[in-house]
Structures are given as structure tokens and as C-alpha cells.
Interface confidence: medium
């Protein structure tokens, strides 16, 4: 009887020896084995010589085998796929001679500190190379010269500080490049050459925005639809491009693609890619967002910077998982610092605290009129919260400002909370809307959703108006939707959303703004716990009295966006904070940040 299970699928003999407590290759493997699974054993070391007689071996899985060394002293002429992931390899031997037919090599989640220059020599058929989650600090020049057929390269989650300038030379078939979560400060000029890369991941690096970044900035501008934010378990084809995820570590996390590069010298060789003198000036604007609690002690003032617009409000949403799970009643303040994106949770005990979000945006009243159209999206019955949108238009020759009214509808049996995004939108004279977003998220440890009040006022005198978005999100597992708008309607037997009282639209952007500086540094994650003894009804009655208030003087766009997780929504906007108070991270700090 074989130690391993044997089956035959797709014409190859498949032998599965996973998790058999093996310390060596089983003696009774069939000679015509085509697919061999040896994962989750305690092999320690492995030599390809032990498999040379398996002339049909095409797939070899050695993942999670506690490997500390690999010897390539035997030729496996048919091996196409080698999985060495989740081991303890600190170095790789030269692979080309032993594995000439290799098309996929996975050495992710090991302890590789460096790679020898010729480690991939001879791997002319290699199409996929996975090196993510190692300790790589640098890459040898010419590393990928032998692998001209490479399609996917994953170098994410390493400690790369720089990249060889010709790393991608000759890789005409490359379609996916993962470089996120490294220590990269810049991209060498000409790094991408003429490659057309459909999927590139560059976020969570220490991009240093100075004159050296201009090549990279221009590449981002030219390839904005190809830059993505990686999310675990989500296929890249199911995500939306997010060029704003690539941020300047030295400029309050402003997007690299909008770095202005003012004062940088121009050289004749830079003009194609680094022509930054043709970018129009943008008037300075400021929106101040204040988060305050009912304890009357803790107040943090935040400033927001305008960020580059996107065609849809959702397209630049970034989901970040909660980085701190409270174990008792407390408020958690997560401050993301630069460089390095270090997350430092600072916790302090407090009584159940209820927050109000104030966006103080003083604005010279613009004339407004309503357009009598309505927009609605129909959710799946009894599953999704309903989506209603009211949008405001400010036509050029309008005379009367009109406040908007928003109705939030919730299906009768919905168990998914209805988060509410209130968006203040007013077009700029240039017709390029500049959305900014503040996110206040109540995470799932709360047993009862906590109402969030948004008081929206108009900005300080300025002829240029900055759109502002406030996203209020309730916990994932709440079965009680949190009303955060002026009117909450629950249809008894209907799965059709109730249309808004008015739908107002903003002028469509005519151009794409590329030089706005935007920052996103700290994220306020508020975990709120209500007293267990308090009935839901009481809490609703007591604290939901102040709901989302749209002041009569306010021209606004209100969009109710269903969210199905408790992640923070971070569009390309800045919440800038610096904790200077002595007593608490929640005490005062004011900022005023201006666009270039």
C-alpha cells in the first residue's frame, strides 16, 4: 500500500504525499509520476537528484516542508512548475541546468536575503516568478535577462530599497508586476522602458518625492489605469485601478502622480517624461474636518487636502483591514506615520463615547438650481442596503441656492448595515471637481451600531470650492442599520428602493487634474462599545436624535453607499494629523494644508 494517494487526472499521474510526516522522499513512488505533492512535510533539505528517474515529473510541490537548503544536482527535464513557498530558504542555487523546462517558480514566503546574479541563468521558459515575502534588500543587475518569457513577477513584501535600472529589459511579455510593500524610494529613469504593463502594484513603499521622482510620476500619469491596490483574495481583474495608492512618504502621503515638481531643473533628456511646466496653477483651498467626542475632553482637528478626481466616486476607494482589535471597552487611535507606513495603535480606556463628525467648509454661496431627475440603484431583495443618491448642480447662471434632502431606505429584513457617505460637492470654476474624503468607521466589536452625526457647514471665503466627502460606516455584523440621514425609511414589503426627493448632478469634469497634492496619513479608527445592559431601543431613542444634518444653506451631494465589510474606506484624500498634545492622542492639533 502506498504512503501517498494516487490518482490520474489530465493524463498525468498525480501522487499526493502532503502532510505525511515525511522526512525523505517515499521509496514507493510510481516511476511515471507526473505531479508530485510533498507539501507540509519535514524534509529539511531536498535534492533534485532524488527525482531524476521520474522522467514524467511536470509539477513538484515542496511548499511548507521546513526546507533550509535545496540542491539542484539532478536534472528534471520535464519539470514545469516548482513550488518552494513557505520554507526557510536563505539562498537559492542556480536552477537553469537542473530545471530547463521550468515555467513557474514560487519561492515566496522564504528567508531569501539576496539572490546570486546567475541564479536564473538557463530558465529561458520561465513565465512566472514569485519572490514575495522574503528579506530581499537588493537585486543583482541582469537578474531577469535569461527569463525573456516572464509574464508575472512578484517582488512584494521584501526590503528592496532600490531596483536595478535595467531589471525589466527585454521582458516584452511581462503583464503583472508586484512591487508593493518594499522600501523603495524612487524608480530609476527609464525603468519601465516601452513595456506595456496591464497590472502593476506599487503602493506601501517609501516613495520620496523630489526631482528624482519625475520620471516615475510621469509614468504613473501615463499608466494610471494600470496601477492597482492589491487586496488579499481578490483577483486583480475584479479590482479598480488606483494610481493614487502610490504616495509620497515625505509629503504627507500625497499621491506621487500629482507631485508638482516645482523648481526642478529640466534637462534635455527629461522633456518627454518630465515636462512639468505646463501644469496649471491651482488656487489654494482648505477644508477642515473636526472629529469630536461627547466626553468633552478629546478633540482632534484634521485638515484635508484636495486630491485628484476620479470618474466615479467609488473608483479610488481603498479598503484597509482593521489593524487593531480591542479586547475591552476602549477607543483605538491608529496613527499611520511616514516613512514606512508604520502603524502604531495607541489605546486608552474610556466610557462608551459617541462621536460627531464636523466638516467645516466655509463657502461663498454659489447660485444653485435643481434638476428634477432621480437616480436609484436596486439592490438584491432583502440582502443589500438600498442606494439612493442626490446630487447637486451649480449651473453658471443659476440664482437661487436650494438645499437638498436625502432619503435613506433600508429593506425590511436586511442584516447589512447601511453606511452613509455624505459628499459636499461644488464645482470649481475650472469644472474640475476635486473630491476629498474623511472616513469615520465604527468597527465590528460594538454590539450595537453607534450613530454618527455629521454636521456640514460651508467653507471659508474662497472663490475656488473644494468638494468634500464624509463617509460614515457602521459595523459589518450589525443587524440594526444606523440611521445617519435626515429621513430613514423602511419599506414594509418592498425590495424597490425609494427614490430621492431630488437628484442633482454636478458638471462632468472636462479634464483630469494631475498636479494636485493630496495626503493621507493618519486614519482615525474608532471602536465603540455600548453598555451591554442598554437596550437597543433606548440607545436608538437616546442617541439617534441628532442624525445627518444637511444645513439649509448647504449645497450638497449625498450618496448612500452600501458597504459589506468593516474596513476603512480611504479615497485619495488626506487626513493630516500631528499629535502635539501632552495628555492624549485625541487632543488638539490643527493643520492648514494648501495645494500648490
Amino acid at each position: 500500500q502506498h504512503t501517498c494517494s494516487i490518482s490520474k487526472v489530465t493524463s498525468l499521474l498525480e501522487v499526493n504525499c502532503e502532510n505525511k510526516k515525511l522526512t525523505a522522499l517515499p521509496a514507493d513512488l510510481p516511476a511515471d509520476t507526473g505531479i508530485l505533492h510533498l507539501g507540509e512535510n519535514q524534509l529539511g533539505t531536498f535534492s533534485t537528484a532524488s527525482l531524476v528517474h521520474f522522467t514524467h515529473l511536470t509539477y513538484l510541490y515542496l511548499d511548507r516542508c521546513e526546507l533550509t537548503s535545496l540542491q539542484t544536482n539532478g536534472k528534471l527535464i520535464k519539470l514545469e512548475n516548482l513550488d518552494l513557498s513557505h520554507n526557510n530558504l536563505k539562498s537559492l542555487p542556480s536552477l537553469g541546468w537542473a530545471l530547463p523546462a521550468l515555467t513557474t517558480l514560487d519561492v515566496s514566503f522564504n528567508k531569501l536575503g539576496s539572490l546570486s546574479p546567475g541564479v536564473l541563468d538557463g530558465l529561458s521558459q520561465l513565465q512566472e516568478l514569485y519572490l514575495q515575502n522574503n528579506d530581499l534588500k537588493s537585486l543583482p543587475p541582469g537578474l531577469l535577462l535569461p527569463t525573456t518569457k516572464l509574464k508575472k513577477l512578484n517582488l512584494a513584501n521584501n526590503k528592496l530599497r532600490e531596483l536595478p535600472s535595467g531589471l525589466l529589459d527585454g521582458l516584452e511579455d511581462l503583464d503583472t508586476l508586484y512591487l508593493q510593500r518594499n522600501w523603495l524610494r524612487t524608480i530609476p529613469k527609464g525603468f519601465f522602458g516601452t513595456l506595456l504593463l496591464p497590472f502593476v502594484f506599487l503602493h506601501a513603499n517609501s516613495w520620496y518625492c523630489d526631482c528624482e521622482i519625475l520620471y516615475f510620476r510621469h509614468w504613473l500619469q501615463e499608466n494610471a489605469n494600470n496601477v492597482y491596490l492589491w487586496k488579499q483574495g481578490v483577483d486583480v481583474k475584479d479590482t479598480t485601478p488606483n494610481v493614487a495608492s502610490v504616495r509620497c512618504a515625505n509629503l504627507d502621503n500625497a499621491p506621487v502622480y500629482s507631485y508638482p515638481g516645482k523648481g526642478c531643473p529640466t534637462s534635455s533628456g527629461d522633456t518627454d517624461y518630465d515636462d512639468y511646466d505646463d501644469i496649471p496653477d491651482v488656487p489654494a483651498t482648505r477644508t477642515e474636518v473636526k472629529f469630536s467626542t461627547n466626553t468633552k475632553v478629546h478633540t482632534t482637528h484634521w485638515s484635508l487636502l484636495a486630491a485628484a478626481p476620479s470618474t466615479s466616486q467609488d473608483s479610488q476607494m481603498i479598503s484597509l483591514p482593521p489593524t487593531h482589535k480591542p479586547t475591552k471597552k476602549q477607543s483605538t487611535f491608529i496613527h499611520t506615520q511616514s516613512p514606512g507606513f508604520t502603524t502604531l495603535p495607541e489605546t486608552m480606556e474610556s466610557n462608551p463615547t459617541f462621536y460627531s463628525l464636523k466638516l467645516n467648509t466655509v463657502l461663498i454661496p454659489s447660485p444653485t438650481t435643481l434638476e428634477p431627475t432621480s437616480t436609484q440603484a436596486t439592490p438584491e431583495p432583502n440582502i443589500q442596503p438600498m442606494l439612493t443618491t442626490s446630487t447637486l448642480t451649480t449651473p453658471e447662471h443659476s440664482t437661487t441656492p436650494v438645499p437638498t434632502t436625502t432619503i435613506l431606505t433600508t429593506p425590511e429584513h436586511s442584516t447589512i448595515p447601511v453606511p452613509t457617505t455624505a459628499i459636499l460637492t461644488t464645482p470649481k470654476p475650472s469644472t474640475i471637481p476635486v473630491p476629498t474624503t474623511a472616513t469615520l468607521t465604527t468597527l465590528e466589536p460594538s454590539t450595537t451600531p453607534v450613530p454618527t452625526t455629521a454636521t456640514l457647514t460651508t467653507p471659508e471665503p474662497s472663490t475656488t470650492l473644494v468638494p468634500t466627502t464624509a463617509t460614515l460606516t457602521t459595523p459589518e455584523h450589525s443587524t440594526t442599520p444606523v440611521p445617519t440621514t435626515a429621513t430613514l425609511t423602511t419599506p414594509e414589503h418592498s425590495t424597490t428602493p425609494v427614490p430621492t426627493t431630488a437628484t442633482l448632478t454636478t458638471p462632468e469634469p472636462s479634464t483630469t487634474l494631475t498636479n494636485l497634492v493630496s495626503t493621507i496619513s493618519p486614519v482615525l479608527t474608532t471602536t465603540l462599545t455600548t453598555p451591554e445592559s442598554t437596550p437597543i431601543e433606548t440607545i436608538l431613542e437616546q442617541f439617534f436624535t441628532t442624525e445627518l444634518t444637511l444645513l439649509p444653506t448647504l449645497e450638497s451631494t449625498t450618496t448612500i453607499i452600501p458597504e459589506q465589510n468593516s474596513f476603512l474606506n480611504l479615497p485619495e484624500v488626506a487626513l493630516v494629523s500631528s499629535d502635539t498634545s501632552e495628555s492624549s492622542p485625541f487632543l488638539n492639533s490643527d493643520f492648514c494644508c494648501f495645494l500648490p
Epitope: 490520474k8 489530465t10 499521474l13 510510481p30 511515471d32 514524467h56
Partner: antibody, heavy 118, light 113 residues
Framework: QVQLVESGGGLVKPGGSLRLSCAAS????????MSWIRQAPGKGLEWVSS???????YYPDSVLGRFTISRDNAKNSLYLQMNSLRAEDTAVYYC????????????WGQGTLVTVSS | DIVMTQSPLSLPVTPGEPASISCKSS????????????LAWYLQKPGQSPQLLIY???TRESGVPDRFSGSGSGTDFTLKISRVEAEDVGVYYC?????????FGQGTKVEIK
Amino acid sequence: QVQLVESGGGLVKPGGSLRLSCAASGFTFSSFAMSWIRQAPGKGLEWVSSITSAGTPYYPDSVLGRFTISRDNAKNSLYLQMNSLRAEDTAVYYCARSRGYEDYFDYWGQGTLVTVSS
Amino acid sequence: DIVMTQSPLSLPVTPGEPASISCKSSQSLLNSRNQKNYLAWYLQKPGQSPQLLIYFTSTRESGVPDRFSGSGSGTDFTLKISRVEAEDVGVYYCQQHYSSPWTFGQGTKVEIK
């Protein structure tokens, strides 16, 4: 030319045993996977068992645990040991050569009839 | 197990005329690694053993007349005889050689009208 000749069929009572043999010639027997396929009277074809050139056996659920395929490369012979026979095992049993590792059958013997009846 | 379904089960033909047999599988027989469809066709003439006609959907076995052709991909396959001859009568079987257990269609009986 390739020749496959089956033998060992006959009448057997339910629960009984029978051993079929297939003598191969005209090709390098040890280099090929071999199979048994059966055909009940007036019915279609049903794969019964295969054995790779290295000696690894395969069975469908219908015969697993009752039938055993084996080969003797020195004798260029293929065998099928059938135990616990049932009435539904009644069929003509063909010995066939499998092409490479692709498991389609390029040469067939003339078949041997196995009848399971009380 | 992959179920193979043939149609029609009986096909009266006229010599010199074309004939077509369909075979459908319950799951795809396409191997994405090599883009081959693992389907074979056999003919069992009256009183004889089956003989291989086509494998990998469209590759004719040596010695098989070129009036026999196979096509299809994924789950739908077809065997065509461009001009039926008297010697083509018998039962035609399709077989998937993609995944064990190897399974056959129930057969299509081709007979002269």
C-alpha cells in the same frame, strides 16, 4: 504487428473468482500502459482497469476492491484477477493498449466472455 | 465521473452522403496546460473489437481514412463522415481520456438505409 490475445473467460457463479490473461506481442510491452475494458451483452463499453508502465493500477469504483490488475513484463502478459463476481460483471472483457499517458486505447484484443450466473 | 452523452443513438445513412454524430461531456475536456481536448472516437464493427479512429478530438489514428474528422472543444464534440461507405457501419463510441475513470458514450449505431 501488434497483437493482444485474451484468455481465461468462462462461466462462474456469483461470488466466485476468475483470472483473465492477455498475451501481448508486436511491441515493447514494458513501455506501455495497459487496460481492461468490458462490454456487457448488447451494451456499451465500460473501462475496468488500467496499469501504467511502472505498475501503478487504476480502477473505477464499480470494481475497486474486487478486481486486481497486474502485469509481468518478462512474459509480456497482463492479468485481471476478478473476485466476488456479480451478475452485472457478465461481459466480454477486452485487453487494450493505452497510448502513452493519454489513456485512449489504440489496440484491442478480440475479447473473452465472462458469464456470472448461478 | 465525467458522463458522456451521444446523439443520435441510431443513425440511418445513405452511402455517399455525409453523417454526423454528436458527443457531449458533463465537464470540459480541455487541458489548459496544452490546449488539447481529451476526446477519442472508436468504431466497433459488427462482431469485431473496437478500433481507434480519432484521439485528442481531431487527430486521426494512422490508417484511418480521411473521410473521418473530429471537431469540438470543451464539452461539445462532433464526429463527421464526409461520404459514408458501406464498411463504415457499426457502433461509434466517444470516450473521454481527460480524467479517470475513463468513460464512454453509450454508442451511436450507424446503419445503411
